[in-house]
């Protein structure tokens, strides 16, 4: 089945202090490799989350990425700040034998608004 | 060497509650997803009950489900199975299996270890 | 419930395969061996084909499109048990075969 990396979402809104989930699905988990979810494009773009075991304070996996056949990659992200607000990417990377892992395909985005508290 | 001890089975009552646990040893026990597999006397293998290596998803079957509850304690390396309004036809040797580095619950391909087994009993 | 054979029987020192499907579509396969009702099954293959470090190497495993099989080269009685193989459905549930018995003749 061909790869295709889908966010379904363009844009979420969500209220300072509250928690908000990015939606990632894959049509395939081949090639073999990592998926990671970044913020921003290009050179000054910001580690989220990874896939592969390292902890990410506040991001958290919504279903069981170890779970065979799982194609579910979303986040959910807790304790929004304003510092969050940005265009966050779901990326499948091809892992390399033994040069670094390549990026194969990138979700379309999704702009996370962070509203101001309601006082 | 990877060890899987499983206790709490014996003679149970109907209608009644067992708590299983099983202590492993000898790897990683929090990188690892664990499943219990239970056995009916003269019959094959049955998946019972699954969990990941976090502890955050749990995957039931469905002779057990709503009935089921299965937790871990990876800083005592222990995983239990909680079975409630025990039947007859939950009598059999419990097993506790663990996934070696693949997988979540409910993938069997990936049990690479197993227990001893503790027998249960469900009888009036 | 997966698909395998009730039985199969080879003469020692023969090649046996033993085959298993039904598993999700994207699936693997263990392969465990029983000896006797009420022992302990062992794990024989996983992930399609691992082999445990105490697992002689005359086993291995393989998967084809949906099917897995389990060869055991040159059987041995010590071989004569029980073998159940074990996947995920497509809804993520575990799942066995009914097992398959090996004879080892002679």
């Known amino acids: 089945k061909e790869l295709k990396v889908t966010q379904p979402e363009k844009s979420v809104s969500v209220a300072a202090g509250d928690s908000t989930v990015l939606n990632c699905t894959l049509t395939s988990l081949l090639p073999v490799g990592p998926i990671k979810w970044y913020r921003g494009v290009g050179q000054s773009r910001l580690l989220i989350y990874s896939f592969t075991g390292e902890h990410f304070p506040r991001v958290t996996n919504v279903s069981d990425a170890t779970k065979r056949n799982n194609m579910d990659f979303s986040i959910r992200i807790s304790n929004v700040t304003p510092e969050d607000a940005g265009t966050y990417y779901c990326v499948k990377f091809q892992k390399g034998p033994s040069e670094p892992d390549t990026e194969i395909q990138s979700g379309g985005g999704t702009e996370v608004y962070v509203l101001a508290k309601p006082s | 060497a990877v060890t899987l001890d499983e206790s709490g089975g014996g003679l149970q009552t109907p209608g009644g509650a067992l708590s299983l646990v099983c202590k492993g040893s000898?790897?990683?026990?929090?990188?690892?997803?664990m499943n219990w597999v239970r056995q009916a006397p003269g019959k094959g293998l049955e998946w019972v009950a699954g969990?990941?290596?976090?502890?955050?998803?749990?995957y039931y079957g469905a002779a057990v489900q709503g009935r089921a509850t299965i937790s871990r304690d990876n800083g005592q390396s222990t995983v239990r199975l909680q079975l409630n309004n025990l039947r007859a036809e939950d009598t059999a040797t419990y097993y506790c299996?663990?996934?070696?580095?693949?997988?979540?619950?409910?993938?069997?391909?990936?049990?690479?270890?197993w227990g001893h087994g503790t027998e249960v009993i469900v009888s009036s | 419930a997966l698909t395998q054979p009730a039985s199969v029987s080879a003469n020692p020192g023969e090649t046996v395969e033993i085959t298993c499907s039904g598993g999700?579509?994207?699936?693997?396969y263990g392969w465990f061996q029983q000896k006797s009702p009420g022992s302990a099954p062992l794990t024989v293959i996983?992930?399609?084909?691992k082999r445990p470090s105490d697992i002689p190497s005359r086993f291995s495993g393989s998967k084809s499109d949906s099917t897995g099989t389990l060869t055991i080269t040159r059987v041995q009685a010590e071989d004569e048990a029980v073998y159940y193989c074990?996947?995920?459905?497509?809804?993520?549930?575990?799942?066995f075969g009914a097992g398959t018995t090996l004879t080892v003749l002679g």
């Open positions: 299996t663990k996934n070696g580095g693949c997988g979540s619950g409910g993938d069997l391909d990936c049990i690479d270890a």
């Open positions: 000898g790897f990683t026990f929090s990188s690892h997803a």
């Open positions: 969990i990941s290596s976090d502890g955050r998803f749990t």
């Open positions: 999700g579509s994207n699936n693997a």
């Open positions: 996983y992930d399609n084909g």
């Open positions: 074990g996947s995920a459905d497509n809804s993520g549930a575990g799942v």
